[in-house]
Amino acid sequence: KKVVLGKKGDTVELTCTASQKKSIQFHWKNSNQIKILGNQGSFLTKGPSKLNDRADSRRSLWDQGNFPLIIKNLKIEDSDTYICEVEDQKEEVQLLVFGLTANSDTHLLQGQSLTLTLESPPGSSPSVQCRSPRGKNIQGGKTLSVSQLELQDSGTWTCTVLQNQKKVEFKIDIVVLAFQKASSIVYKKEGEQVEFSFPLAFTVEKLTGSGELWWQAERASSSKSWITFDLKNKEVSVKRVTQDPKLQMGKKLPLHLTLPQALPQYAGSGNLTLALEAKTGKLHQEVNLVVMRATQLQKNLTCEVWGPTSPKLMLSLKLENKEAKVSKREKAVWVLNPEAGMWQCLLSDSGQVLLESNIKVLPTWSTPVQP
């Protein structure tokens, strides 16, 4: 008995060939011996089987002695043994229809689990192997699970179902809903305008939800909500914003926040959460603000940074075009009785300058000028 594998929703063509290369009488029946279709001369006739409105043949092939059964929009319950009767012969074809679906939505939040469920006909014992877009292979039976989805899992998953040494391939498009970056750091001099951007790593036609930015200032004992907003069809509208600082928010995606000026009291870490409509869970992006201030008070030139800096960062004070006078893995450095000239305060990581602030030290009889 010939075995044919089909995919739920697809079309399958079961072949039946007569030795005579001409149009003769034929019938396709199901295992209950109920007629699906056949011919009456050059006319196609259909029986009362459940396949009635989804079964067809190719009249153009009848003259060549070919009498296919075409089944459209396959269902799992179409799995059956189909019998073609032609020239006093019976040809049997076993059709096995499989379906593979993501048990939840195919749009999943980063960190969530993906479960792929195989629908299969009773009595079948298929094996499934899926390959993720980043090349990871997973194997299973009726269900396959992948926990902790990552951004790289977005894309087309290719799954192969194997049964009776035959295989059928499914492709499922998975979208992992996440921000492009899990975390970002913004380095700013005191007084500068700060731009926070939260680009999404996916595109969908309609995006609706709500979000909030919570901020933990380094100097504050507790975190506070800086802004709440709504997202409707990719349009952003602010619901509530603190008076200090008074953030501004862009009306379109990507989510964009502007802090009018960087001040030491704002330095710290924020967590932007985005709750999407019809999704359980939230998207998160951490954002950090590091603020630098260079000051000269009497005979003391000081450079300070506030905010989440890593211990390996180096803070230096140097006179322009000269070697650093002071370099420390600390958040404040100073020089007593600095020479006149343009001093640079540098925050660097392995030689790469992250933040720079210049201060002009005048001869001792003058007051300092900050450019």
Partner: antibody, heavy 120, light 107 residues
Framework: QVQLQESGPGLVKPSETLSLTCTVS????????WSWIRQPAGKGLEWIGR???????NYNPSLKSRVTMSVDTSKNQFSLKLSSVTAADTAVYYC??????????????WGQGTTVTVSS | DIQMTQSPSSLSASVGDRVTITCQAS??????LNWYQQKPGKAPKLLIF???TLETGVPSRFSGSGSGTYFTFTIRSLQPEDIATYYC?????????FGGGTKVEIK
């Protein structure tokens, strides 16, 4: 066991639409074809058409342009609408279940029938 | 559509008689034929399917035969409760069609 009960107006005016409902009790409506058959007084049986629980239909070509069938699985009901009726549509209307088994295809369960008269 | 022609349209026989009804199809319908019994004021009841197989609970005095285009229905020994109209119905192809019916009466 499964029982069928037709319901609907017994009198319909010419050119109007005849509407009948069949309620299935004692079993599930799912995974069967459900058909409508009519019988004018003193005459034979005419198959009007059938509907599967998925909503797919097959109608008798002689009535196709006037027939609409629908199914409501939540209520275990299926219905028939026949538009632009004339006196020739006066008949007893039956609903029935079509059953397929091995070497078997027949209407094994019938309603008791409801008489519909088309008259002004 | 497949036309089903039944004959006779009516017959009268005595209790205990053998009664035969014929049904002819306009096309070859293999053995895709049912026989129904309809008593006055009642819905039809399926007696025979697949041309010759008795439905469960149907008395063995009823039988069917035939294949292709010609079929017969027989009541071996007519009983008073057999007074009814008998219909053949093909299920080879849609639309499902019935014969015109044979009314069986007792003399």
């Amino acid at each position: 066991q499964v029982q069928l009960q037709e319901s609907g107006p017994g009198l319909v005016k010419p050119s109007e639409t005849l509407s009948l409902t069949c309620t299935v009790s004692g079993g599930s409506i799912s995974s069967f074809y459900w058909s409508w058959i009519r019988q004018p007084a003193g005459k034979g049986l005419e198959w009007i058409g059938r509907i599967y629980t998925s909503g797919s239909t097959n109608y008798n070509p002689s009535l196709k342009s006037r027939v609409t069938m629908s199914v409501d699985t939540s209520k275990n009901q299926f219905s028939l609408k026949l538009s632009s009726v004339t006196a020739a549509d006066t008949a007893v209307y039956y609903c029935a279940r079509e059953l397929e088994k091995r070497n078997y295809y027949g209407m094994d369960v019938w309603g008791q029938g409801t008489t519909v008269t088309v008259s002004s | 559509d497949i036309q089903m022609t039944q004959s006779p349209s009516s017959l009268s026989a005595s209790v205990g008689d053998r009664v035969t009804i014929t049904c002819q199809a306009s096309h070859d319908i293999s053995n895709y034929l049912n026989w129904y019994q309809q008593k006055p004021g009642k819905a039809p009841k399926l007696l025979i399917f697949d041309a010759s197989t008795l439905e469960t609970g149907v008395p063995s005095r009823f039988s069917g035969s035939g294949s292709g285009t010609y079929f017969t229905f027989t009541i071996r020994s007519l009983q008073p409760e057999d007074i009814a109209t008998y219909y053949c119905q093909q299920y080879d192809s849609l639309p499902l069609t019935f014969g015109g019916g044979t009314k069986v009466e007792i003399k």
